[in-house]
């Protein structure tokens, strides 16, 4: 499966939208920094078959969609930017789902690495727990926004490696 060039562009647009979403100066939020334990090894892409890598990327984007679709998120971010954000995430999910369907029967290995999917879910559970503990404060959301931008940048590296693997 070829991940379309539009997918990379959508990823870049997603990062640009997230960069615009800030509502307060992050400089006031230094003390709220937190170690969410980003599962770097799941995005290194070395130990994966292609289909498994795609499923991990899909899970990350799905979890991001879920995180920013909550009532608390809607109350925090600009509605217009959120709508653009959802559109880009939806586009990426569709691209990855189409790719996963094409990979069916291509590889002998399972389409999904369950352990990796669970690792990504636990990462997002830690983010949600942090937001809850911080009572969804503006600074907590700023820290989460920075973390998601970083994770998207790192996942973009995996996507590029997948593109080069064709």
């Amino acid at each position: 499966c070829d991940l379309p060039q539009t997918h990379s562009l959508s990823n870049r647009r997603t990062l640009m939208i997230m960069a615009q979403m800030g509502r307060i100066s992050p400089f006031s939020c230094l003390k709220d920094r937190h170690d969410f334990g980003f599962p770097q090894e799941e995005f290194d892409g070395n130990q994966f078959q292609k289909a498994q890598a795609i499923s991990v990327l899909h899970e990350m984007i799905q979890q991001t969609f879920n995180l920013f679709s909550t009532k608390d998120s809607s109350a925090t971010w600009d509605e217009t930017l959120l709508d653009k954000f959802y559109t880009e995430l939806y586009q990426q999910l569709n691209d990855l789902e189409a790719c996963m369907m094409q990979e069916v029967g291509v590889e002998d290995t399972p389409l999904m690495n369950v352990d990796s999917i669970l690792t990504v879910r636990k990462y997002f559970q830690r983010i949600t727990l942090y937001l809850t503990e911080k009572k969804y404060s503006p600074c907590a959301w700023e820290v989460v926004r920075a973390e998601i931008m970083r994770s998207f940048s790192l996942s973009a590296n995996l996507q590029e490696r997948l593109r080069r693997k064709e």
Partner: antibody
Framework: EVQLVQSGAEVKKPGESLKISCKGS????????IGWVRQMPGKGLEWMGI????????AYSPSFQGQVTISADKSISTAYLQWSSLKASDTAMYYC??????????????WGQGTLVTVSS | DIQMTQSPSSLSASVGDRVTITCRAS??????LNWYQQKPGKAPKLLIY???SLQSGVPSRFSGSGSGTDFTLTISSLQPEDFATYYC?????????FGQGTKVEIK
């Protein structure tokens, strides 16, 4: 390879203006903040201020607020430190360093080589 | 502003010695503390971040500990290249502040 390359040494007279630069390469320039640190001859390190190159938001140490201006041009991955009117007491080595912002990552993990500014009549 | 106080301001030691430098913050900073090494004419170099995490590429003889207000940088076995000035820096809040430095000299 991550690098921060600063502009060369400067010799200026009191009252003159100056703008020194710090060019980042080998990483996404807008994903990190750039901080500036002063070191006067034979003295310790003093944090001056910081900029987020993605939107040019700045924060200054109260000691340097109004004394210097920090700016950035993300199109050329460069941050700047400038003075409108130098004083002899501005004589120092100035370093830029990158900061991970709100991410849980090492602070000031890469530094420029330093720019020596000498102000003398 | 958060004040950072290092001790001692200088010390003399021999190669192979165990060296300990302390840093005290004027208020609790959790584990938001970094340690840097600076050699004459060179830019500072990050050694330890978040109080105890060893920066990539830094020898394991360097270690950091502490949290709250009291922190320690330890060099388990001093090497010739370790003679330098060491600075702590609080990373909790702006303005970021450094300790005054500890110069490690050859005995």
């Amino acid at each position: 390879e991550v690098q921060l390359v600063q502009s060369g040494a400067e010799v200026k007279k009191p009252g003159e203006s100056l703008k020194i630069s710090c060019k980042g390469s080998g990483y996404s320039f807008t994903s990190y903040w750039i901080g500036w640190v002063r070191q006067m001859p034979g003295k310790g390190l003093e944090w001056m201020g910081i900029i987020d190159p993605s939107d040019s938001d700045t924060a200054y140490s109260p000691s340097f607020q109004g004394q210097v201006t920090i700016s950035a041009d993300k199109s050329i991955s460069t941050a700047y430190l400038q003075w409108s009117s130098l004083k002899a007491s501005d004589t120092a080595m100035y370093y830029c360093a990158r900061h991970p912002g709100l991410n849980w990552a090492p602070d000031f993990d890469y530094w420029g080589q330093g720019t020596l500014v000498t102000v003398s009549s | 502003d958060i004040q950072m106080t290092q001790s001692p301001s200088s010390l003399s030691a021999s190669v192979g010695d165990r060296v300990t430098i302390t840093c005290r913050a004027s208020q609790s900073i959790g584990d938001f503390l970094n340690w840097y090494q600076q050699k004459p004419g060179k830019a500072p170099k990050l050694l330890i971040y978040f109080a105890s995490s060893l920066q990539s590429g830094v020898p394991s003889r360097f270690s950091g500990s502490g949290s709250g207000t009291d922190f320690t940088l330890t060099i388990s076995s001093l090497q010739p290249e370790d003679f330098a000035t060491y600075y702590c820096q609080q990373a909790l809040d702006f303005p970021l502040t450094f300790g005054q430095g500890t110069k490690v000299e050859i005995k």
